[in-house]
Structure formats: C-alpha cells, structure tokens
C-alpha cells in the first residue's frame, strides 16, 4: 500500500531513508536536456523474495537532441567526479551494514539523472531527519517518521525534531549535544518527498545516522 502523502516537513531539516521497503517506487527522472529512453521503465521498483531485495528495472536517460538513439551522454568531469566519489562513499558506509530483510538500499546514480529523486513510499517506511548545515537541533526527540495505516488511511508520524539557527546556550551547563549537520539545501528544498541526488546530504546523513539506526533498531 502506497503512502498517500509526503513525509512531514521539518523546517531547516532534510530527511533520508536508510533502506527502502519492498514496493517502493523511484521515478526515472532525467536532468534538463535528457529524457527517459523510449523502451525504458518510468520507475524502478524495490522487489524481492524472502532472502534478497533489489531494484527492478534500470533508469536510463538519453539526450533529448539525439533522435532514436539510446546513446548515453558522458557526464562532465566535475559531475562524474562527484558522482563517483559519493557513490564510493555510500558503498563504503553500507558495506559493513547488515542488510535489512525486505528492504532495498539506495540505488546507485544513473547517468544524466535529475538532481532530485522522487520516491513513492509504502506503509511501514521509516525516514530519518537531520538539521541542515548552519542549524542545530534545539530539541531532538524521535527524529524519524513512519508511514502507518490507521482506519484505512495512511499517515506519517510526526518527527519531534526542532531545528534552529539561534545560538541560545544550553540551560544545562556542560551538556553539549553533538550535531553533525549535512550540507544545507535551500529552504524551499528541505524535507521533501523529493530527495536530492547531490549525494552530499545523503551520504553525510548516512554516515552519522546509519550505524546508530542499525545497532539500536535492527540488531
């Protein structure tokens, strides 16, 4: 069952799924000047059996200018460098993590992918929130949201994270809360169902969150 709405927004925060439940769809979006190949699937789907989950279909983009060809256009060196680096970081971070049954990992980037990823989540999906760079957690309760089915309708639970740019000192002296902030998105782009594929955010959030999440929740 697909979740009707986007996960809740938190001002000055962004969210990330550590793993995607089977049934999750990821739109095959291409960046400006490129389009999905004619025979290509409009989305990738997280599917699996009892022992293994993976993304079905592969997203492929081709130049809008190129007619009747599926030739892949090589990304610019700068872009290629960033993608390779971030992909490597993701792989390194995830290598020693236990695979979560019934879930897929973040799909690797595809060439000429759009700068944002649009996911369609399913009931039972959890996403995790983090304050963006330049903001700190004034309050960090459960910084996660779960898509639940209640009375036949889906709803996301409300994360109890408040991010602030104010530098009010703690009223409990000596109690300093570590806050690893990922690179910031512009305010209009934070905390949306659309997640950025400029993987700086995702990988940094992953680096600070995944070990904690997996050790506390799944072991």
């Amino acid at each position: 069952e697909l979740c009707d709405d986007d996960p809740p927004k938190i001002t000055h925060a962004t969210f990330k799924a550590v793993a995607y439940k089977e049934g999750t769809m990821l739109n095959c979006e291409c960046k400006r000047g490129f389009r999905r190949i004619k025979s290509g699937s409009p989305y990738m789907l997280c599917t699996g059996n009892s022992s293994h989950s993976s993304w079905d279909n592969q997203c492929q983009c081709t130049s809008s200018a190129a007619r009747n060809t599926t030739k892949q256009v090589t990304p610019q060196p700068e872009e290629q460098k960033e993608r390779k680096t971030t992909e490597m970081q993701s792989q390194m971070q995830l290598a020693d993590q236990v695979s979560l049954p019934g879930h897929c990992r973040e799909p690797p980037p595809w060439e000429n992918e759009a700068t944002e990823r649009i996911y369609h989540f399913v009931v039972g999906q959890t996403v995790y929130y983090q304050c963006v760079q330049g903001y700190r957690a004034l309050h960090r309760g459960p910084a996660e949201s779960v898509c639940k089915m209640t009375h036949g309708k889906t709803r996301w639970t409300q994360p109890q994270l408040i991010c602030t740019g104010e530098t009010e000192p703690s009223q409990f002296p000596g109690e300093e809360e570590p806050q690893a902030s990922p690179d910031g998105l512009p305010e209009s782009e934070t905390s949306r169902l659309v997640t950025t594929t400029d993987f700086r955010i995702q990988t940094e959030v992953a680096a600070t969150m995944e070990t904690f999440i997996f050790t506390t929740e799944y072991q």
Epitope: I10, H12, H139, G141, P159, Q160, I162, E177
Partner: antibody, heavy 115, light 107 residues
Framework: QVQLVQSGAEVKKPGASLKISCKGS????????MHWVRQAPGQGLEWIGV????????IYAQKFQGRATMTVDTSTSTAYLELSSLRSEDTAVYYC????????WGQGTTVTVSS | DIQMTQSPSSLSASVGDRVTITCRAS??????LEWYQQKPGKAPKLLVY???TLAEGVPSRFSGSGSGTDFTLTISSLQPEDFGTYYC?????????FGQGTKLEIK
C-alpha cells in the same frame, strides 16, 4: 494516556515573580519539546516560547525575552515557566503544550496580577 | 514575525451546514500549519496538523487544506458540539504565531 497537569491558580502583585509547573505523564517526557502559550481574558492565544525537555535549550518570543524563564526537571517529568516583573497585562491563563504540533495541552493555570 | 490572519472573525451556522474558515499567512509557510478548537474555559484541542492531517480521534467531518499562504478548515456537516473558537497557528519557525481566532456559534 497522555496528560499534562498544571499547577493551580495564582494571584500576584505587580512587580512580583511567578513560577508555574506542568507535569507530563503517559509518555516519554524527553521525547517532546514543551511550549508555553498564554491567553489574556477574552483574547487570543500568544506563544511564549519552547524548551527542549532533552537538552534544556529554550527559545523565547521576543516580547518575553529576559522576563520569562523556562526550565525542566526530567527526574519529575515537569516543565516550569517563571515570569518576573509581573504587570497587570500578564493576567492570563497560561498553558503548556506538547511537541511540534501542540498535540496535548495542560488544563491551564489562571494567573491574576492585581494590586 | 509571521502574521496569521483568520476570516471570518465570527460566524453563525446551522446544524448540518458546511462551514469554512480561512487562514492566511504573511509569508509562505509551506504546510507548517495547525488548526485548534477551543471551548469556553477549556484548553485548545488539536484538530489538524501539517495543514491537512487529521489529529487522532478527530471526527472525519473536519478537514484541512491549503499550502503556502492560504489555508482552509472545513466542517462538512456542522454538529451542535462544534461550537467554539477555532485558531490556526504556524510552526514554520520561531516565533510560532496564532491567528486571532474565529468564533463559531450554532444558530
């Protein structure tokens, strides 16, 4: 079930200070920030500030900066609001409210400031 | 600070009527908006959060909509127990501010 229980009504003289409490039960107290809101007689709702029940960090509406102090005691799951240099305009019902979306409210504490 | 303006400030309606209350923010607040109902002498009660999500236990005749600067609370079929004052409030960023309230009376 979730409950926020506030301390009883107070009558104060102008210039005095006031400290009211809000005790949370039925949930993990430190999971939810606590807001304070007041309502003058016949008026609307006015946000005073928010405190992290986890870290003790607080943010105040500019109007209350320097005059209001919010604190928490996690051992008793209680949030406090202290207001100094009281004036007649502070006569109001003071509420505590839980979390990002103010999903539960205390019953209110009536404060009367009069000479 | 973000100003929240509600309209109308008061209205009178009959049982079974469809009632709409609007709330306008002075700047874009996305969907960071809540609606509360308050009865005389009682604390406010959360009805809708994040502009359109119905709070637990709230009857389905209540619904919220809108995004950006314009928001609506709708009661599809007014019941006698729906009288009271309704407030909108944003949680976009501190300071959180409330609308001035809409007093709903049953005819």
């Amino acid at each position: 079930q979730v409950q926020l229980v506030q301390s009883g009504a107070e009558v104060k003289k102008p210039g005095a200070s006031l400290k009211i409490s809000c005790k949370g039960s039925g949930y993990t107290f430190t999971d939810y920030a606590m807001h304070w809101v007041r309502q003058a007689p016949g008026q609307g709702l006015e946000w005073i500030g928010v405190i992290s029940t986890y870290s003790g960090d607080a943010i105040y509406a500019q109007k209350f900066q320097g005059r209001a102090t919010m604190t928490v005691d996690t051992s008793t799951s209680t949030a406090y609001l202290e207001l100094s240099s009281l004036r007649s305009e502070d006569t109001a019902v003071y509420y505590c409210a839980r979390g990002v979306t103010f999903d539960y409210w205390g019953q209110g504490t009536t404060v009367t400031v009069s000479s | 600070d973000i100003q929240m303006t509600q309209s109308p400030s008061s209205l009178s309606a009959s049982v079974g009527d469809r009632v709409t209350i609007t709330c306008r923010a002075s700047q874009d607040i996305s969907n960071y908006l809540e609606w509360y109902q308050q009865k005389p002498g009682k604390a406010p009660k959360l009805l809708v959060y994040n502009a359109k999500t119905l709070a637990e236990g709230v009857p389905s005749r209540f619904s919220g909509s809108g995004s950006g600067t314009d928001f609506t609370l709708t009661i599809s079929s007014l019941q006698p127990e729906d009288f009271g004052t309704y407030y909108c409030q944003h949680h976009y960023d501190t300071p959180y501010t409330f609308g001035q309230g809409t007093k709903l009376e049953i005819k």
